[in-house]
Amino acid sequence: GPVWRKHYITYRINNYTPDMNREDVDYAIRKAFQVWSNVTPLKFSKINTGMADILVVFARGAHGDFHAFDGKGGILAHAFGPGSGIGGDAHFDEDEFWTTHSGGTNLFLTAVHEIGHSLGLGHSSDPKAVMFPTYKYVDINTFRLSADDIRGIQSLYGDPKENQRLPNPDNSEPALCDPNLSFDAVTTVGNKIFFFKDRFFWLKVSERPKTSVNLISSLWPTLPSGIEAAYEIEARNQVFLFKDDKYWLISNLRPEPNYPKSIHSFGFPNFVKKIDAAVFNPRFYRTYFFVDNQYWRYDERRQMMDPGYPKLITKNFQGIGPKIDAVFYSKNKYYYFFQGSNQFEYDFLLQRITKTLKSNSWFGC
């Protein structure tokens, strides 16, 4: 069955049952997630707006899925396995009387069970397991997962020792096949493509389906996370990496000494504080720097900006912009522009978009 392909998972409580104080609901749900994070590398974070991985909903009767609730008793709740959209979401029947104790239906105990489903667990045949299909109150102060529950969840995600590789949520590996995935910077490096995101980069070797994820610091310990733009001059075996108003030069995959340097050495005006994206075109021997809704063109031979810039992205790259996240050059005729979770193959000879893709389409998602 499906699992979350990341260790940092968000949840949001869509609405609150009137049966309990909001603080008690928050606490019960938080503690229920904690039960599973205690025995896995998973980290859960509550968000209050936007799209969470797991949406917690209190609803009665028909509520937008195929599985209408049945009034008091019977089905107490249900949850969907990991995935986008409704995937992971946990629904609690508002016709139950939700409580913090043994009266009514205990929200914490029910939530532990449902979150198990949200993480990809099925039902257990062990009556002592929290994933056993029927509800039975146990003292929540002494509650523990059964050996069967732990075995089940660790077969999906491993044990918490794996957290030592990812010490905090910011370090969490983004889900490569998340349809909403965006990238900070993308560049070719020889026959490889580097995709940068937060502290990570994915390495795609041309024409091979396999990709690997790495920490930037594992390859280049002196470089920061959050690379914002990157480009390659393959003939010189050089890669330029940008963050804020600084850039680093990598030669033959090794960081050059005496870097970082200021981006203003390229000739940007003082108001430019960071580069969104950059790409070198070897046919023209020019680098295009994208900043907000504009771009500059830099002559790599003469080491100076071309006159007449900046220009509007939308004016000269039909269908692209107003801003972009990343871009790289490939196959002698295409730029691949990244905007959020979308990617545009742009033929710079025809000067038009020839294909629209998801940003992660390179990974066989």
Epitope: G83, G85, G87
Partner: antibody, heavy 122, light 103 residues
């Protein structure tokens, strides 16, 4: 490549029976919920029935409950719809559609077959 | 049962136009709404799921928004291939469809 291919449609008299099949390929069939959705000529889409990956859970629209039976044979990667006591209003193109993996159906139909036409007429 | 009301039922527009189709649920369905495109004689195609997520391979001129009871599908700049019928859907309920025709 995910593919769904329906067959078994045809002309049948009111009160008659028909069995539709949907052959699936390109994915692990037994993991996925699968559904039948129909479309009467010139009309909109109407969900008919759905079945979980294991076959243990089935659902029906009120308009077909008691007359239609959904089933699947995971060893043959095939979905079925047994239609009995057919009526003129059951005339439609019947599509099979793939849903998500998991214990519950999302009703998220990401892949569809081309459809097979069922005509109920005397 | 939840009802889905889609409007308008038909719409004439020109290439390059921005078009919006709306769908209203009779009660909250959170973000559990999908949009499909169907061309004559073809099977429906999933465009948007979970109200606002673009299905892989669908052009970015399509976008969805909304939550609770009110949802919209927007095509930012109509292309010739976009003339079709569009359906909203949640679980077993489809909207009645919006036929988008060339003006």
């Amino acid at each position: 490549e995910v593919q769904l291919l329906e067959s078994g449609g045809g002309l049948v008299q009111p009160g008659g029976s028909l069995r539709l099949s949907c052959a699936a390929s390109g994915f692990t069939f037994s993991d996925y919920w699968t559904h039948w959705v129909r479309q009467a000529p010139g009309k909109g889409l109407e969900w008919v029935s759905g079945i979980s990956g294991s076959g243990g859970m089935t659902m029906y629209a009120d308009s077909v409950k008691g007359r239609f039976t959904i089933s699947r044979d995971n060893s043959k990667n095939t979905l079925y719809l047994q239609m009995n006591s057919l009526r003129a209003e059951d005339t439609a193109v019947y599509y099979c559609a793939r849903d998500i993996v998991g214990p519950y159906s999302a009703g998220l139909f990401d892949y569809w077959g081309r459809g097979t036409l069922v005509t109920v007429s005397s | 049962d939840i009802q889905m009301t889609q409007s308008p039922s038909s719409l004439s527009a020109s290439v390059g136009d921005r078009v919006t189709i709306t769908c209203r649920a009779s009660q909250s369905i959170y973000t559990y709404l999908n949009w499909y495109q169907q061309k004559p004689g073809k099977a429906p195609k999933l465009l948007i799921y979970a109200a606002s997520s673009l299905q892989s391979g669908v052009p970015s001129r399509f976008s969805g928004s909304g939550s609770g009871t009110d949802f919209t599908l927007t095509i930012s700049s109509l292309q010739p291939e976009d003339f079709a019928t569009y359906y909203c859907q949640q679980a077993g309920i489809f909207g009645q469809g919006t036929k988008l025709e060339i003006k």
